[in-house]
């Protein structure tokens, strides 16, 4: 199964999920870390504001489930959430899912290797109790708590390598790219919007590659 197989529109699209707009467009008032997407975004200003809060109402997710998460670490999770909620450039990696809270998700988004490495390094000294944050929480209080028997330890003991963090954390929403920032071949979580959004070029490249592959498959089936 190739990423994006369920969609024909791969460029400048918003995912069908809990808080996403149906179509991307300008959002002048995007908050703080989400501001790089203000020229063209899938998130609203209020979503961008809310996701900067601890235990925001968006998902009732508490970053501080094992004591206070270090600010240097937390900023990566906020940036990850901005990318998830705001980016119109992840169409090539959208997959349909049968989940109560969303109809689509991202799978294997090629995250630039430096962004993953830095995220992992900055979270070394923070603490968590799980290696996959999509499932297995105790939600009885309405907010995620560590399940019985899950001990709070350093991030490194649950995510021993950069790939374990970036690929395992959200059930393989990301994969670590072998490409570097600025290559045009990997998605940047962090970018300076004064230079434009580098992820537009990346989405175009992978969308084109997927259309070529789809064409080859059609050609193959036609002759066999």
């Amino acid at each position: 199964a190739d990423p994006g197989q369920d969609r024909t529109d791969l460029l400048n699209v918003c995912m069908d999920a809990k808080h996403h707009k149906t179509k991307p467009g300008p959002e002048d008032k995007l908050h703080d870390q989400c501001s790089p997407w203000k020229k063209n975004a899938c998130c609203t200003a209020s979503t961008s504001q809310e996701l900067h809060k601890d235990t925001s109402r968006l998902y009732n997710f508490n970053w501080d489930h094992c004591g206070k998460m270090e600010p240097a670490c937390k900023r990566h999770f906020i940036q990850d959430t901005c990318l998830y909620e705001c980016s119109p450039n992840l169409g090539p990696w959208i997959q349909q899912v049968n989940q109560s809270w969303r109809k689509e998700r991202f799978l294997d988004v090629p995250l630039c290797k430096e962004d993953c490495q830095r995220w992992w390094e900055d979270c070394h000294t923070s603490h968590t109790c799980k290696s996959n944050w999509h499932r297995g929480w105790d939600w009885t209080s309405g907010v995620n708590k560590c399940p019985a028997g899950a001990l709070c330890r350093t991030f490194e003991s649950y995510f021993p390598t950069p790939a374990a963090l970036c690929e395992g954390l959200w059930s393989h929403s990301y994969k670590v790219s072998n490409y570097s920032r600025g290559s045009g071949r990997c998605i940047q979580m962090w970018f300076d919007s004064a230079q434009g959004n580098p992820n537009e070029e990346v989405a175009r490249f992978y969308a084109a590659a997927m259309h070529v592959n789809a064409g080859e498959m059609l050609h193959h089936h036609h002759h066999h």
Epitope: V97, S131, N132, A150, P160, T161, P162, A164, G168, V176
Partner: antibody, heavy 118, light 109 residues
Framework: EVQLVQSGAEVKKPGASVKVSCKAS????????MHWVRQAPGQRLEWMGW????????KYSQKFQGRVTITRDTSASTAYMELSSLRSEDTAVYYC???????????WGQGTLVTVSS | SSELTQDPAVSVALGQTVRITCQGD??????ANWYQQKPGQAPVLVIY???NLPSGIPDRFSGSSSGNTASLTITGAQAADEADYYC???????????FGGGTKLTVLG
């Protein structure tokens, strides 16, 4: 393209040691863990242990604790598995496998057959 | 215990749907992964993180999970799907990995 290429087949006598290598290419070696899994003829897959290629930390299955040593050479992007005090029941194909997240092995080596016979 | 239990053998008629299961306590809080292994070959990842399909794996393969049981479903089984199937999972205590005993799938007809 990601590739894991293992060293060739070995024949060893009981009591000896064997060291199998696994050369990785096509990805950033230190960003992933490398695991070793073995399979005796006609038997199930059996997890042996893993190494964090970034910092060299290791974790071994209780069954092999004290007999297995997993190491890596980051400059050569190569992982090694050494098994000592070999016995006939160690005759198996030994695989290295890249771990994307605690047990999701997306790439495997071709396997190395180790035969232990007197 | 940290064991994963699989049925030793399952058969399916060509073109029919088959479900292979994997049971164990570690699956309550960790995802299962599934591998296909053909004789003389290395295993191939067919489902990871419970339901994700690696690139190049046909979408007749799917994964799901409920409680302490993970399932691999093949919808419209083909002759090429005849193989051994193994599940594995992380065991949270000690960061170990455990494999199931494997299920031999036979495709009839």
């Amino acid at each position: 393209e990601v590739q894991l290429v293992q060293s060739g087949a070995e024949v060893k006598k009981p009591g000896a040691s064997v060291k199998v290598s696994c050369k990785a290419s096509g990805y950033t070696f230190t960003y992933y863990a490398m695991h070793w899994v073995r399979q005796a003829p006609g038997q199930r897959l059996e997890w042996m242990g893993w190494i964090n290629a970034g910092n060299g930390n290791t974790k071994y299955s209780q069954k092999f604790q004290g007999r297995v040593t997993i190491t890596r050479d980051t400059s050569a992007s190569t992982a090694y598995m050494e098994l000592s005090s070999l016995r006939s029941e160690d005759t198996a194909v030994y695989y290295c496998a890249r771990d994307i997240s605690y047990g999701s092995f997306d790439y495997w080596g071709q396997g190395t057959l180790v035969t232990v016979s007197s | 215990s940290s064991e994963l239990t699989q049925d030793p053998a399952v058969s399916v008629a060509l073109g029919q749907t088959v479900r292979i299961t994997c049971q164990g306590d570690s699956l309550r809080s960790n995802y299962a992964n599934w591998y296909q292994q053909k004789p003389g070959q290395a295993p191939v990842l067919v489902i990871y993180g419970q339901f994700n399909l690696p690139s190049g794996i046909p979408d007749r393969f799917s994964g799901s999970s409920s409680g302490n049981t993970a399932s691999l479903t093949i919808t419209g089984a083909q002759a090429a799907d005849e193989a051994d199937y193994y599940c594995d999972s992380r065991v949270s205590t000690g960061n170990h990995v455990v494999f199931g005993g494997g299920t031999k799938l036979t495709v009839l007809g």
